[in-house]
Structure formats: C-alpha cells, structure tokens
C-alpha cells in the first residue's frame, strides 16, 4: 500500500458525505446504495463513521461531471479515466468526482459504481495507489464478480496505518496476494502463451517472459473478464494459437484476449466421464498432438487432432509417471521434459528416459 506524501489523513473519525448530483444511468436509490456500501468497505476495518448529508458542505462531496467540471482536472470522455478523488484536506479535500461520460451500473456491464467509489474513497481517506495487483487501490479497474466483496489485506494494512483498526471487523477474511517466494507456495495451473509462461495462482497469474527473471503479476480477470476468478488447469495449442482454460466442469478456448464462440463447453464433451468434476492439470504435446488431462489420481490422454479420448485411458498417475505422487496440481512441458507440480514441489521428468531427473521447489519456476 501507499499513503500520500506528508501522510494526509482526517483528524476526526466521524466524516460526512453528500451526493451533490446523480448519474442518469442508475436510479437515485441504486446510486445511494452503491456509495453507502463503498464507505462501509472502509468503516468496517477502521474506527471511521460516515454520515450522509442532504445539503450544505460535507467533508466528502460526491458529484458526477463530464470533461472540464470545475477543478482543472478534466475528464476525458468514454473509457480512459473513470473518476478521481482528492486526498483529505479542506475545500476540495476528500471530494470524489465521477465521469458521467461513462455508463455506471450496479453490475458487470459498463463500470460498477460501487467498485469505482470504493477505490476513490480510499483516496478520499488518504490512500494513494498500491503496487499490489490484488489491492482495491491498484490503479487498474477490474470487476471481480458478483460475489460478496472482500477488502484485500493490502488495503486493510494501508487504511489501518492511518486510522487504526475498528472495534470489530464483520468480514475478517481479507484476501492476500500470493508471494512468489513463499516456500510453501503451490500453483494452480501453468501454460505457455506465445512464448511466455503463464503461472496461475488463486485469482492471479504471473507472466514470465523467456528473457526475464522478474515475473509480472496480474489479476486473471484484468486480462479475461469473462473467465472465473480462479482456474484449475490450462494448456496451449500453439499451432492453432489457442489456450484452453479449465474450471470445474467447464472449459474455455482463448485466442489471445478473445474467448472463442461456443465456449465455455462441458469437459464431458472431451469424452471424460460424467463423474469427473474437474481437471487439476493439463499439458499438450505439439509433436504428437496429444494432451494429458489429470484429475484426482488418474490421467487421460486426449487426441487434439481427431478430437477423441485415446483408448486405454484413464490410467493411474503413479503407474505412468512413477515417483511424482498421486496428484498433479499443475504441469507443463519444455525441451523434452515434463514439469509436474505437487504442492510446494516440482518434479522434472524426462520423457526420453521415463524417470524423474530433478526435484525442485515449485517456485523455482518463478526464479525463487
């Protein structure tokens, strides 16, 4: 997290806000509800209280405007910048302005007013942008779904550094962003994508360029908003310029940032039995056109060329790949070796000699 220079913060815990005007995109009641919920995000974890005023001057004046709207920080039409807010202080201090050239909603369509307001009110209270891609105060807008919003841990640490903790946090579960060098780190899925490596963990992925040691961390939904927050497995089909992503009983085919029409499909369409609830890992072999799909302690082999499951499958993981354990969390292939991830460990397995060559920490793929 980051606070503003000179640690700008309110010197009182009881703050007022006023909704000066409304967007035509939502009902007054929806707007009021979005702002009330956005303030509650911050009051739940601090001693701060927010009271709405209907007239007069409030600490935090909230308004909708377009282009030049009176503060010498003009908005820029649709998309681009969504809103802005001023750090704590007199006059404009704390005020939040929303660009009414955007389409504001209480869903995933357009821009979600609650989510943008929660971010902007973080500025109103003294938080600057965070470098943590999982933080609400990260500068990128990413709608993360309809489920109950949980303030990430980074934002909690930031706001409590200014105002201290509240009496009782009604939602004490605050998601932490994974630390790539945590020795207990396990991974969800790994795939290549156009020469880069994508390493998925929780609602994030690391993107590793072949010539770089420093992997960049992103929210999965910031690249593919239509995908679920978390994924189970992934593989690339390079000759078709596609990657396949699995979650539960569904899978998606992606070309770059675009989901192919007709997806998601059911994994049963690949020929997997109905009782298979999820794929835990997947890896494609371009030279043979075959894909291994792992689930529980079993492995299936799919023929990507003829679109059928190979006979004699499923087989037991332990029989086909002795020594790697009876489950696979993530897997990828490179230069004749398969890398199997099982908890915090990875096994380098030689296809040629059919045996484990090396055992390494899972996060050595991230240069830890």
């Amino acid at each position: 997290y980051n606070v503003f220079p000179r640690t700008l913060k309110w010197s009182k815990m009881n703050l007022t806000y006023r909704i000066v005007n409304y967007t035509p995109d939502m009902t007054h009641s929806e707007v009021e509800k979005a702002f009330k919920k956005a303030f509650k995000v911050w009051s739940d974890v601090t001693p701060l209280n927010f009271t709405r005023l209907h007239d007069g001057i409030a600490d935090i004046m909230i308004s909708f405007g377009i282009k030049e709207h009176g503060d010498f920080y003009p908005f820029d039409g649709p998309s681009g910048l969504l809103a802005h807010a001023f750090p704590p202080g007199p006059n404009y201090g704390g005020d939040a302005h929303f660009d009414d050239d955007e389409t504001w909603t209480s869903s995933s369509k357009g821009y979600n007013l609650f989510l943008v307001a929660a971010h902007e009110f973080g500025h109103s209270l003294g938080l600057d942008h965070s470098k943590d891609p999982g933080a609400l105060m990260f500068p990128i807008y990413t709608y993360t779904g309809k489920s109950h919003f949980m303030l990430p841990d980074d934002d909690v640490q930031g706001i409590q550094s200014l105002y201290g903790p509240g009496d009782e946090d009604p939602n004490p579960k605050h998601p932490k962003t994974p630390d790539k060098c945590d020795p207990s780190l396990s991974l969800d899925a790994i795939t290549s994508l156009r020469g880069e490596t994508m390493i998925f963990k929780d609602r994030f992925f690391w993107r590793l360029h072949p010539q770089q040691v420093d992997a960049e961390l992103f929210l999965t939904k910031s690249f593919w908003p239509e995908l679920p927050n978390r994924i189970d497995a992934a593989y690339e089909h390079p000759s078709h310029d596609l990657i396949f992503i699995f979650r539960g009983r569904k899978f998606w085919a992606l070309n770059g940032y675009d989901i192919l029409e007709g997806y998601p499909k059911k994994i049963s369409e690949l020929g997997l039995p109905k009782e298979v609830k999820k794929i835990s890992a997947a890896v494609h072999f371009e030279d043979t056109g075959k894909t291994l799909l792992f689930s529980g302690n079993q492995v299936w082999r799919y023929d990507d060329t003829n679109h059928i499951m190979d006979k004699d499958y499923p087989r037991l993981i332990e029989e086909d790949f002795p020594g790697i354990g009876d489950k696979v969390d993530a897997v990828y292939e490179k230069n004749g070796y398969i890398y199997f991830f099982n908890g915090p460990i990875q096994f380098e397995y030689s296809i040629w000699s059919n045996r484990i060559v090396r055992v390494m920490p899972a996060n050595s793929i991230l240069w830890c």
Epitope: P74, D76, G77, P78, S79, G80, L81, L82, A83, H84, A85, Y111, V116, H119, E120, H123, H129, P139, I140, Y141, T142, E216, F218, S222, Y257
Partner: nanobody, 126 residues
Framework: DVQLVESGGGLVQPGGSLRLSCAAS????????MGWFRQAPGKEREFVAA????????YYADSVKGRFTISRDNSKNTVYLQMNSLRPEDTAVYYC???????????????????WGQGTLVTVSS
C-alpha cells in the same frame, strides 16, 4: 490480435525535430490507451506520453512536457509523437504500446501494457 509498427526514427541534430508514427492494426481501438516509451542504451524503459484513443486526452512525462506532442488519427489507425527541441539525452529506441485495460483515475506508465511494437531508433547528435 493487435500489431504495432513504428517508423520515423533517425539521426537528428540537437534542437531539431522528428515525427514518429505508430500504425496499429488488428482490432477496434476505441477503448485503448496508446503510449510511447523509450529505452536508452543501458537504461530502463521509460514512459514518454500516452493518449486515450477514444477522446484524444493526452498525458506526458515531465521530461518531455512542452517539447513532445502525442496525437492520433482515427481514420488511419495511427498514433504520432511529434518531438521538438530534441536533446542528446532523448537518444533512445522509441516504442509504441497499447493498453486495453481501464484505469480508475490515472494513466499507466509502463508495466501492464499489452502490446508493443518493435521500436524505432532516434539518435540526437551533432
């Protein structure tokens, strides 16, 4: 997918001008932020300027404010960087980049741009 091709680089004397072009192809750009970046030999890549494709709003690094102008021509799917009063310290490979993501209240300055061109070399020397 998106392809970006830069052109217009070359050798110019201090105080001179150059106009770089970035031709974009491959998809609709209405929600993109387009940026110019540069990388001098042995240095980190740094932000130069950005433009909101749909509105034309512009943002600049302090080091180029008043000297460089970013603009775009929607009909040609091209972004330009007009560079005036060039200095030896402006010598670098200049890259065009596109970012499809949306920012709450500030424009990005490097990490996270989705697409990059190959770069064009600008040398400022007498």
């Amino acid at each position: 997918d998106v392809q970006l091709v830069e052109s217009g680089g070359g050798l110019v004397q201090p105080g001179g001008s150059l106009r770089l072009s970035c031709a974009a192809s491959g998809r609709t750009f209405s929600r993109y932020v387009m940026g110019w970046f540069r990388q001098a030999p042995g240095k980190e890549r740094e932000f130069v300027a950005a433009i909101n494709w749909s509105s034309g709003s512009t943002y600049y690094a302090d080091s180029v404010k008043g000297r460089f102008t970013i603009s775009r021509d929607n009909s040609k799917n091209t972004v330009y960087l007009q560079m005036n009063s060039l200095r030896p310290e402006d010598t670098a490979v200049y890259y065009c980049a596109a970012d499809r993501r949306v920012y709450y209240d500030t424009y990005p300055n490097l990490r996270g741009y989705d697409y990059w061109g190959q770069g064009t070399l600008v040398t400022v020397s007498s």
